[in-house]
C-alpha cells in the first residue's frame, strides 16, 4: 500500500487584513490512524494553529467535516486575518499513540497579508 502523502496544493495565499484565509490540505490515505494539526512556521518555535484532537481554536473552522472517519480533507479557514498571521502554514499528520507522534508534513502554504483596502 502506498504511504500517506500530505498535499498542500497552494504554495502561497494572499489575503487582505480582516478577511478570512482558506488553507488547503488533503491526505492520500486513511492509514496510519491519527490526528491532523496545523502549524505556523517550522521547528521548535512553530505555533499551533489547529489541533483536530483537542483544544479550542476560535478563529479556525474546518472546511469539511474533519471528524468523519473517512474524511481526507483537512483544509481550514482562519478568520479576521492580521499582519501577525503572515507566515508559512504546515498541515501535519500525526500517528496515534501515547503521545501522538509526527508522521508527515505538507510542503507548506505561505500566507501573506495585504493592507486592508481603505
Amino acid at each position: 500500500e502506498e504511504e500517506l502523502q500530505v498535499i498542500q496544493p497552494d504554495k502561497s495565499v494572499s489575503v487582505a487584513a480582516g478577511e478570512s484565509a482558506i488553507l488547503h490540505c488533503t491526505v492520500t490515505s486513511l492509514i496510519p490512524v491519527g490526528p491532523i494539526q496545523w502549524f505556523r512556521g517550522a521547528g521548535p518555535a512553530r505555533e499551533l494553529i489547529y489541533n483536530q484532537k483537542e483544544g479550542h481554536f476560535p478563529r479556525v473552522t474546518t472546511v469539511s467535516e474533519s471528524t468523519k472517519r473517512e474524511n481526507m480533507d483537512f483544509s481550514i479557514s482562519i478568520s479576521n486575518i492580521t499582519p501577525a498571521d503572515a507566515g508559512t502554514y504546515y498541515c501535519v499528520k500525526f500517528r496515534k499513540g501515547s503521545p501522538d507522534t509526527e508522521f508527515k508534513s505538507g510542503a507548506g502554504t505561505e500566507l501573506s497579508v495585504r493592507a486592508k483596502p481603505s
Partner: antibody
Framework: DVQLVESGGGVVRPGESLRLSCAAS????????MNWVRQAPGEGLEWVSR????????DYAESVKGRFTISRDNSENTLYLQMNSLRAEDTAVYYC????????????WGLGALVTVSS | ETVLTQSPATLSVSPGERATLSCRAS??????LAWHQQKPGQAPRLLIY???NRATGIPDRFSGSGSGTDFTLTISSLQTEDSAVYYC??????????FGGGTKVEIK
C-alpha cells in the same frame, strides 16, 4: 473551570534570582501560548514574556531580555519564569495569563505572585 | 511599536449613569483590541475582545465599539461593583503586547 495559580514570589536582593511557577488546570494546556504580565505597585500592566504552545518559541519585553527565561512543562501543566540579575525596578506582581488563541488576547489571568527586589 | 492611549485617566460617575472610556491606538489595530477590568487587589479580568465581543459571563451593561485606531468601552448603567481600573490591550502587532495606561472609574 480554567485556573491559573502562581507561586514562588518573595523578597530578594538586587542581583539575586527567583523562579516563578504557574500551575494550570481546566483547559488543554499544551494547546495554548502562555504569557507573563507584571504590574509594579500603583502602576499599569506590562507584558513581560510569551511562550508558544510547544515551548520552543519565546518572546520577551526589552526590559527583561537576557535576564528572564520563560519555559513550560506540558506534561505537568506548568509555566515558569526564571528571573536572574533582579533589579529594584522588577518589583511587581507577576501574573500568568492564558492566550485565547496563538495570535490573541489574554482570556484568563492568575491571581498573581508578588516579587519584591530590595536591598 | 503601537502605543495605546487611554482617556480620561480618571472618571467619576454616579451609580446608574453611563460611563464612556476611550482607547486610541497610534496606528491601526483593526478590530484586535480587548478590554480588561481590574478591581482593587484583584487580578485583571477579560471584559471585551475583538473590539465588540463580550467575554463569557460579562453583564450586557458592558459594550465595546470602534475599529482601526479609536475604541470605546461603555458601561451603560454604572453599578458600585464596576469601580475598577480598565485597560485596553492590542494584539494586531506583536511582540510586544501592549496595554493602555488604564482608566480608573470611581463611583461618585
Amino acid at each position: 473551570d480554567v485556573q491559573l495559580v502562581e507561586s514562588g514570589g518573595g523578597v530578594v536582593r538586587p542581583g539575586e534570582s527567583l523562579r516563578l511557577s504557574c500551575a494550570a488546570s481546566g483547559f488543554s494546556f499544551s494547546s495554548y501560548a502562555m504569557n507573563w504580565v507584571r504590574q509594579a505597585p500603583g502602576e499599569g500592566l506590562e507584558w513581560v514574556s510569551r511562550i508558544n504552545s510547544g515551548g520552543g518559541g519565546t518572546d520577551y519585553a526589552e526590559s527583561v531580555k537576557g535576564r528572564f527565561t520563560i519555559s513550560r512543562d506540558n506534561s505537568e501543566n506548568t509555566l515558569y519564569l526564571q528571573m536572574n540579575s533582579l533589579r529594584a525596578e522588577d518589583t511587581a506582581v507577576y501574573y500568568c495569563a492564558k492566550q485565547y488563541d496563538w495570535n490573541g488576547f489574554f482570556d484568563y489571568w492568575g491571581l498573581g505572585a508578588l516579587v519584591t527586589v530590595s536591598s | 511599536e503601537t502605543v495605546l492611549t487611554q482617556s480620561p485617566a480618571t472618571l467619576s460617575v454616579s451609580p446608574g449613569e453611563r460611563a464612556t472610556l476611550s482607547c486610541r491606538a497610534s496606528q491601526t489595530v483593526g478590530s484586535k483590541l480587548a478590554w480588561h477590568q481590574q478591581k482593587p487587589g484583584q487580578a485583571p479580568r477579560l471584559l471585551i475582545y475583538d473590539a465588540t465581543n463580550r467575554a463569557t459571563g460579562i453583564p450586557d451593561r458592558f459594550s465595546g465599539s470602534g475599529s482601526g485606531t479609536d475604541f470605546t468601552l461603555t458601561i451603560s448603567s454604572l453599578q458600585t461593583e464596576d469601580s475598577a481600573v480598565y485597560y485596553c490591550q492590542q494584539y494586531y502587532y506583536w511582540p510586544p503586547y501592549r496595554f493602555g495606561g488604564g482608566t480608573k472609574v470611581e463611583i461618585k
